[in-house]
Each structure stands twice: as C-alpha cells, then as structure tokens.
Amino acid sequence: SGVFQLQLQEFINERGVLASGRPCEPGCRTFFRVCLKHFQAVVSPGPCTFGTVSTPVLGTNSFAVRDDSSGGGRNPLQLPFNFTWPGTFSLIIEAWHAPGDDLRPEALPPDALISKIAIQGSLAVGQNWLLDEQTSTLTRLRYSYRVICSDNYYGDNCSRLCKKRNDHFGHYVCQPDGNLSCLPGWTGEYCQQPICLSGCHEQNGYCSKPAECLCRPGWQGRLCNECIPHNGCRHGTCSTPWQCTCDEGWGGLFCDQDLNYCTHHSPCKNGATCSNSGQRSYTCTCRPGYTGVDCELELSECDSNPCRNGGSCKDQEDGYHCLCPPGYYGLHCEHSTLSCADSPCFNGGSCRERNQGANYACECPPNFTGSNCEKKVDRCTSNPCANGGQCLNRGPSRMCRCRPGFTGTYCELHVSDCARNPCAHGGTCHDLENGLMCTCPAGFSGRRCEVRTSIDACASSPCFNRATCYTDLSTDTFVCNCPYGFVGSRCEFPVGLPPSFPW
C-alpha cells in the first residue's frame, strides 16, 4: 500500500490556445486530469489501472502551481494504491480548458483539451522527487513525482505491513525495510522476550520484564545464583536447593547439633587446652597452677606439694620456697645428706644404700610415695575421670563425679539418650556418638517424630517435564526444581519463544 504523488509546478501556454490551435475565450481556464496505470511500452488509452485524479482550475494560460499540501492536499496530487508497487508505471497528464464551472468529462466539449503528455518508466519507492519537464509546440509543463509507502507499510515495494507496538504482542518499532527494531530491554524475533538483569542465572532465574531477575523455587539472591537451604537449617549451607550441608563443627539434620563446643564457646579458662569429646561435651587440660572442670580455679603453688623429703612449702609472691628438714637440701629438698643409718624412710618404707652408701632410696609400702615415703598417694593426680568428670579423694580410694550425660566409674560411659524413650508416635531411637536420632513412621516427622505430616508430597510425582521434586519437611509440601526451559509451580510452562507471527 502506498501513494503515487504528482507535484505540478508550472504550466506555460503563452498564446492561450487549445490543442486544436483555437484560442480560449477569454483565456484558457486550466485544470488537469491525471491517469496512472501499469507500464506500457507505448502508452495507450484504456483503464487507469493504478488510479485517476482531477484538479480544480489552477490558473489561466501560464501560471505557477502553489504547493498546497498543507492546506487541503491538492498539490501534490495523491494517487493511492493498495497493492505491491511494481516498480514501473505509465502516466498521462491532460490539461483542459473549463469554459464553465462543471468540470465533469461529459460536460466539456471534446475540443477543450489544451495538451496531453504521456510518460512511462521505472520508479523506485523513495522520498526523493523526480523532476521532469514536457514541452509541446504550444505548451510546457514542469512537474515532479515520487512513490512513497502508506503509513505502516515498508520495504522496496511497500508490501511489508509493520505497526510499532509496546504491549504483550511485542515491544518494537519498524525499520525502513519493515524489519522490527526491538525497544531497549527486549529481544527475540518479535521482541516479546525481556532481557533479564545482567548476570541473572540462565537456569535458576527468569524475568517477565526487562532488567528483572525472578528466582525459580529453591533459589534466591539478586541474580538467583544462591540456593535456599533446607527450612530450619541452622549452621549449614547448600549447593543445590533444600540441602543442609553442615559447617565444620556442627551436625544433625538441621546442623543445629554442636560438635565443636571448644571453638564455639571457649569454655576452658586460664589458657587451658580444650578437647571436644562429643556433642556439647569437652575436656579442659589445665596449665600448672589451675584446676576445676574449666580450669577456672587458681591453685596455690604449694598445693602441688613441690617440697620433697618432708620439706614444708611457703607461698611467696613470685612462687614458693621449701624449708627442708635436717639432712636435706635443694630447691625441692631433693638432695639428701642422710644415709640408711639415719632411718630416713617413713611409713614402713625400707631403705636401700646407693653409690657405696653415699646415697639411699626408699621402697614405699602401698598408698605412700615420695623419696622418703612421706606422702600419701593422691589417686587423682593422673586425671582418671573422662569426659570432664571431677576426681575426688575418698581416703584410700577415689571416685569420679560425672558431668550430665555420662556415667561409669571413670565417667567413660554415655548415658543412653534413648533410655527415656524420646521418640514420639512409635519412632525408633538410635544412639549416636553425638546424641540420638529418631526414625519416624510414615505420617510423622520432626527430630522427635512430633510433627504429624502427610505422606511424602513428592510421591504423586507432581512435577512435569522431568523436574526434580523436593519435599519441604517443614510444610509437607513439594517444590519442583525446573529444568532449563520450563517455569511454573509444577514446571508446566515452557519458556521459549512463541512461534512466528505471520507478517
């Protein structure tokens, strides 16, 4: 669809005569008839296949024709067509004399014709005017012409219909050749596909408008590249949705069981060394001068009985001092000036000479120690109590006071977490090193089988298009993780471009 436009510029008829040579009375009141038709090697009379148009009286004898396109559209003359422009044409322009006001062909005498020109040739669609001048014996006509496409028609022959739009059917403007030019933020053959936020994950994100990044189930973050861990996951991460991979030092289904009490709570005081010994269980190894489960108690330096051979200990600001009994000397009264002759062994200990009598050694009876058998044996010095148990001397024996969760002579046994039947609704209890685990019967979930649930929401295979189904244990619903190319709560919608429009 397009328009052949003819712009009449000047007509010269100096003598004011008709084609027959007869003069017009009083002058030639001139109007034009235009016939546009298909290409003919020799332009002949016949139907004006591309259209006709007539003008009103434009002037008398010789005159210039005003450009009247702004005020009524009479010049240039418009010859619209509703077909593909063939690129060739024939044009007949007749100048007629109008004796009266009736310009209809049947109202005019046949000899009212002033002049007739006929041209034919090639004409491409375009904005540029072609200027032409046709001269006969008595007249001259100067004019220009062109072919342009109608609104919304494009291409070399005005055959491509294109209407700019910005709605659900497309977001584009039309190029001169009729091809689409997508508006910013849109892509695809018909500019229906939004360009998502730069960096938005191809599989895990999508968008319904430009510069957006909406996450598919199981993903989060500005670019939908962070998986969502299992609901309730405390100290864990994920690499795929709904996982709960525990951080170092944490265990359990929700990574909420503390396996590294030492690091997370630093219970040992005064520079003691902490050792994990189970879930929420630890042992502190105290530095010299400290005691207590958490090495929180400061010992007097004399408490370790550093003075040997019956020497008495005196606390001092910078340490301690041993007052040695007669016959002994040294920092800890460890050197003897005595021999067996001096009966140095107490509590029934037997004396043995050494170094040809220059020294001696005492062999102590049970429950006594020291170089002179002067000390009762402290059965707690070897830290026999495990799992942070506290050692207590009880006369000739010792006992361990255990921390909660442990039992046995040396606190070496875990109290069975399952002994109190913690699993509800018939769940089976399993003792673990770091606590217990309940295996729940169908229809129940939770750490202690306390939550009544429906049967596995994924059992009915609700996800389409080979999507992965995850059961959300906290809500007993399913979540579908869609493969690339599908969206929807069940991955039921394909994402790809729609098939082609027909235009």
Partner: antibody
Framework: QLQLQESGPGLVKPSETLSLTCTVS??????????WGWIRQPPGKGLEWIGS???????YYNPSLKSRVTISVDTSKNQFSLKLSSVTAADTAVHYC?????????????WGQGTMVTVSS | SYELTQPPSVSVSPGQTASITCSGD??????ACWYQQKPGHSPVLVVY???KRPSGIPERFSGSNSGNSATLTISGTQAMDEADYYC?????????FGGGTKLTVL
Amino acid sequence: QLQLQESGPGLVKPSETLSLTCTVSGGSISSSSYYWGWIRQPPGKGLEWIGSFYYSRSTYYNPSLKSRVTISVDTSKNQFSLKLSSVTAADTAVHYCARGSIAVPDAFDIWGQGTMVTVSS
Amino acid sequence: SYELTQPPSVSVSPGQTASITCSGDKLGDKFACWYQQKPGHSPVLVVYQDNKRPSGIPERFSGSNSGNSATLTISGTQAMDEADYYCQAWDSNTAVFGGGTKLTVL
C-alpha cells in the same frame, strides 16, 4: 480440532461471586502458541472483554472490572477459570471463553458456545 | 480509555457491496479485526490484522485500516451475511470491542 466449553452456575445472587470454568480440549492450555480470554455479552448488547492470560503467566484485565475479576489456570485439568466478585444485575450476560493464537495475532479465533449467567436474588 | 465507534445499522441489497466502518483514535496504527455474530451463536472471526481472512471465510469479506478508521467490506452481499458485526483492536494490553453494527440484507 480445539474446542472450548464454559461451565458454571446459571444463577448467582447479588453481592456474591460469579465463578466459571473453561475446559480446553484438543490442545494444551500451556502452549506458548496461544493466549486465552473471557468475553461477555449482556442481553441485547455488544461484546465486552473481561480479561486474558498468556503462556508466560501474564494476566491482563479490563480496567473497568479489574478490582473484581480474577482469572486463574489449572494446567493439570487443562482448564482456566473466571471469578467476578460483588456481582450486580449489570453483570447478567452470556459469558464466552475464547482462544487467541500467535498465528492470528490481536484476535480471538476460537470461541466457546457461551454460558448465560443471571444475577438475581 | 480507548473507544471504537461503529454505526448501529447498515442496510444493503443482495449482490451489492456493504461497508461497515469502525473509528478510533489512530486506529490505523493498531491492528483491527472483525467478528460476525448471528442470533443465538458465538462470534466468528472473519478478518484479522486489518485485511487477512482466516481459513474458511469467503473471499467476499475484506478489510482495510488507515488513519482513524477501519472498514469491513462485503462484496456481493448474500442473505446469509445478515448478522451483527463487531470490530476489535488492542490498546496497551487491553482488548476493545466496537459497539456492533447490525447488517440488514434487504
């Protein structure tokens, strides 16, 4: 051959919610080649578009009805539904569901046979 | 809101050409389509995208659209063409229907 069939109550009381379902047979409602819509026609009057939804799950409504209308889809049943709340006698009409095709853009090329809904107490 | 205006009625003699107009602001910049509706029946699409015919629609139905007006032309009108005709276009994701024209074949 794709066919559309509307169903729902023929009588609704004023202030209640009108609910209709369109069942699609002979084609998939989740195909990216189609869009779907509801159109109504009061007795003796012209056609009025209610709303449409698309394969990308975008939904558009007639601005004059937007506050009262909801269109939803159930792909498992190959159905889409219309809910119009707070109805009055002015909502009495034949309600049509229709399909638009990407191959026939900007038009509804297949229509259901329509179902008459009367709003009256 | 966008409006499309149609004449309420048009009459034509059998065999003659019937023209039904639909006017709207810059309608030529949108794609227009036309539906035929006979009493008691659902609408049937007869012209889409200004001037295209769906399969099964007779060649006597044609359309044009430019400026502020779209036209449905039925050449060689037959008695069976007597019906209501509706134009429709989209404006910003909203479908708009004309008020309808009753075509009477005399």
